[in-house]
């Protein structure tokens, strides 16, 4: 769709006659009839198939034409045609005169036609005017004519139909050739697609208009590059959505069973090792002069009784020491200058002389001993008490004060911990040496079975065009991850283009 | 009222020539196209030719090209036909009418002229 | 050239009754949204008088009865309610391309 533009510039009729010779009374008051046909090698009577316009009248006999003239008339003469320009033409321009204000052919004289002139030739679309000039015997016409497009069409022969728009169907203004050019943040064929947030996931990011960054299910963060974990994962990550991969140390469904009680905790206090021992179980090796379960009592080394024969042990900053009674020497008072002469041994107990009287041996009666039976018998320095139980002395006997989980004179019975039934939902247990292990059932799970879950909702295979499925273990449902190109619940329609321009 | 009134009727010889004349009146001459068509004896209609009154533009039908010759005279209205080579088969009643550019065809026609061609 | 074929040769028509002929061009006949095609109606002893042009324009001064219609390769005429006076020899033309040609003419009678 274009327009041939005819500018017309100057007419001159001197001798104001007619084509038949006939003089014009009072002047010859010029219109034009102007039609624009396709090319013809001898202009052709027929159709004017490029269009026809009339002028109204502009002077009389000689004059110049003004742009967009008054009295009705424009100037350049406008031909729409809404076909493909061809790149040729005839054009055919006759000059009346008109006596009256009726300019209808049927109202004219009969010889009333002053000149005719016909061109053929080509002519390209552009904005640049063809100047061009017709003589006759009695007449010269000068005018330009050029074609352009229509609003909206574009190309060499105007063919070619661009629309600029903003909305739905398409972001873009047209270039000269007719081709579109989208605006910023826009891509795609019609410009229609957006132009997500820089760094936007290709997969799992998509966007609605430009610059923006909208996550598909599963994911997050700013570029949508963060997968979802599981919901309720507590110490836990994961690589795709819904999976909760425990961190070093955690364990169970949702990574909230500690496995790393000694490195999250550290319950063993004054320098001891402490050793994970099942969940939420450690034990702590003490470092000497330390005792209880987490090494928190500091033990006077005096308490072992280290020194013989009757010494009193004394506790110093970096030890103890032994005052020997008199008869007795070294670090322990193990050396003895006594005899049984001496009557060394106490608490009733027997002398028995050795090595021909040169040292000793007491034979003491029960609930004493040491080298002269000097010591009452601590009964707790067996430690019989079991499992890190601990052994206190009470007068004549001892007793075991034993940990959690533990009974038994000397603690060495395991309390059953399956005895209260802590399975839910129908769970096996199962008693371990450091607490218990419930087995559950379909459906369930966690540590006491106290999870409901669904069995897998994407065993059944949902997802439609090789789209990524995961079981939303909270509401037992799936969620399916699209591919490009496809979406729905189950990624199972196509994501299409208008086949052709919609407008 | 327009008029298109064309020479009276000729008797040829075989390999003669003869120039028929149209003169119009009632309109601008100039501004429109002379056809020249050919009806044989009980025969259909035949084109065969027209010419521009405006300038020496002329198309003939390539079937009487060579033989056929256009012209007008502006000063007075009045268009020729000039058929030469003439043969029997030229005998027919031979039509002025006129035309113009925008599509109305050939509205208005002479009343004829008859040319034999005998030996 | 383009050849013109007519349909049919001769027609007798009832006084009232409609009359249709049909013309057929060997090639399309359309150019630029226009068919260049025309009717004429030739009494005996007479010239050719213009009833169409442009496949469906009526010429000056022809009655309503005669309508023309049709595009490209096929056209009719159509005489709605013949009258007495409509017994002619009638021509289809086609001037997009030179030599113009007619079609071989359709006689209408009285039956």
């Known amino acids: 769709s274009g327009v041939f533009q005819l500018q017309l510039q100057e007419f001159i009729n001197e001798r104001g006659v007619l084509a038949s010779g006939r003089p014009c009374e009072p002047g010859c008051r010029t219109f034009f009839r102007v039609c624009l046909k396709h090319f013809q090698a001898v202009v052709s009577p027929g159709p004017c198939t490029f269009g026809t316009v009339s002028t109204p009248v502009l002077g009389t006999n000689s004059f110049a034409v003004r742009d967009d003239s008054s009295g009705g008339g424009r100037n350049p003469l406008q031909l729409p045609f809404n076909f493909t320009w061809p790149g040729t033409f005839s054009l055919i321009i006759e000059a009346w005169h008109a006596p009256g204000d009726d300019l209808r052919p049927e109202a004219l004289p009969p010889d009333a036609l002053i000149s005719k002139i016909a061109i053929q030739g080509s002519l390209a679309v552009g904005q640049n005017w063809l100047l061009d000039e017709q003589t006759s015997t009695l007449t010269r016409l000068r005018y330009s004519y050029r074609v352009i497009c229509s609003d909206n069409y574009y190309g060499d022969n105007c063919s070619r139909l661009c629309k600029k728009r903003n909305d739905h169907f398409g972001h873009y203004v047209c270039q000269p050739d007719g081709n579109l050019s989208c605006l910023p943040g826009w891509t795609g064929e019609y410009c229609q697609q957006p132009i997500c947030l820089s760094g936007c996931h290709e997969q799992n990011g998509y966007c609605s208009k430009p610059a923006e960054c909208l996550c598909r299910p599963g994911w997050q963060g700013r570029l949508c590059n963060e997968c979802i974990p599981h919901n309720g994962c507590r110490h836990g990550t994961c690589s795709t959505p819904w999976q909760c991969t425990c961190d070093e140390g955690w364990g169970g469904l949702f990574c909230d069973q500690d496995l790393n009680y000694c490195t999250h905790h550290s319950p063993c206090k004054n320098g001891a090792t402490c050793s994970n021992s099942g969940q939420r179980s450690y034990t702590c090796t003490c470092r000497p002069g330390y005792t209880g379960v987490d090494c928190e009592l500091e033990l006077s080394e005096c308490d072992s009784n280290p020194c013989r024969n009757g010494g009193s042990c004394k506790d110093q900053e970096d030890g103890y020491h032994c005052l020997c009674p008199p008869g007795y020497y070294g670090l322990h008072c193990e050396h003895s200058t006594l005899s049984c002469a001496d009557s060394p041994c106490f608490n009733g107990g027997s002398c028995r002389e050795r090595n021909q009287g040169a040292n000793y041996a007491c034979e003491c009666p029960p609930n004493f001993t040491g080298s002269n039976c000097e010591k009452k018998v601590d009964r707790c320095t067996s430690n019989p008490c079991a499992n890190g139980g601990q052994c206190l002395n009470r007068g004549p006997s001892r007793m075991c004060r034993c940990r959690p989980g533990f009974t038994g004179t000397y603690c060495e019975l395991h309390v059953s911990d399956c005895a209260r039934n802590p399975c839910a939902h129908g769970g096996t247990c199962h008693d371990l040496e450091n607490g218990l292990m419930c087995t559950c059932p379909a459906g369930f799970s966690g540590r006491r079975c106290e999870v409901r879950t669904s069995i897998d909702a994407c065993a059944s295979s949902p997802c439609f065009n090789r789209a990524t499925c995961y079981t939303d273990l909270s509401t037992d449902t799936f969620v399916c991850n699209c591919p490009y190109g496809f979406v729905g619940s189950r990624c199972e329609f196509p994501v299409g283009l208008p086949p052709s321009f919609p407008w | 009222q327009v008029q298109l009134v064309q020479s009276g009727a000729e008797v040829k010889k075989p390999g003669a020539s003869v120039k028929i004349s149209c003169k119009a009146s009632?309109?601008?001459?100039?501004?429109?196209?002379i056809h020249w068509v050919k009806q044989a004896p009980g025969q259909g209609l035949e084109w065969i030719g027209y010419i521009a009154g405006y300038k020496d533009a002329t198309n003939y039908n390539q079937k009487f090209k060579g033989r056929v010759t256009f012209t007008t005279d502006t000063s007075t209205s009045t268009a020729y036909m000039e058929l030469r080579s003439l043969r029997s088969d030229d005998t027919a009643v031979y039509y002025c009418?006129?035309?113009?550019?925008?599509?109305?065809?050939?509205?208005?026609w002479g009343q004829g002229t008859l040319v034999t061609v005998s030996s | 050239d383009i050849v013109m074929t007519q349909s049919p040769d001769s027609l007798a028509v009832s006084l009232g009754e409609r009359a249709t002929i049909s013309c057929r061009a060997s090639?399309?006949?359309?150019?630029?949204?226009?068919?260049?095609m025309k009717w004429f109606q030739q009494k005996p002893g007479q010239p050719p008088k213009l009833l169409i042009y442009?496949?469906?324009n009526q010429g000056s001064g022809v009655p309503d009865r005669f309508s023309g219609s049709g595009s490209g390769t096929d056209f009719t005429l159509t005489i709605s309610s013949l009258q007495a006076e409509d017994v002619a020899v009638y021509y289809c033309q086609q001037s997009k391309e030179v030599p113009w040609t007619f079609g071989g003419g359709t006689k209408v009678e009285i039956k």
């Open positions: 090639e399309s006949v359309d150019n630029y949204g226009i068919s260049f």
């Open positions: 442009a496949a469906s």
């Open positions: 009418a006129r035309d113009y550019d925008y599509d109305v065809g050939m509205d208005y």
């Open positions: 009632g309109y601008s001459f100039t501004a429109y196209y």
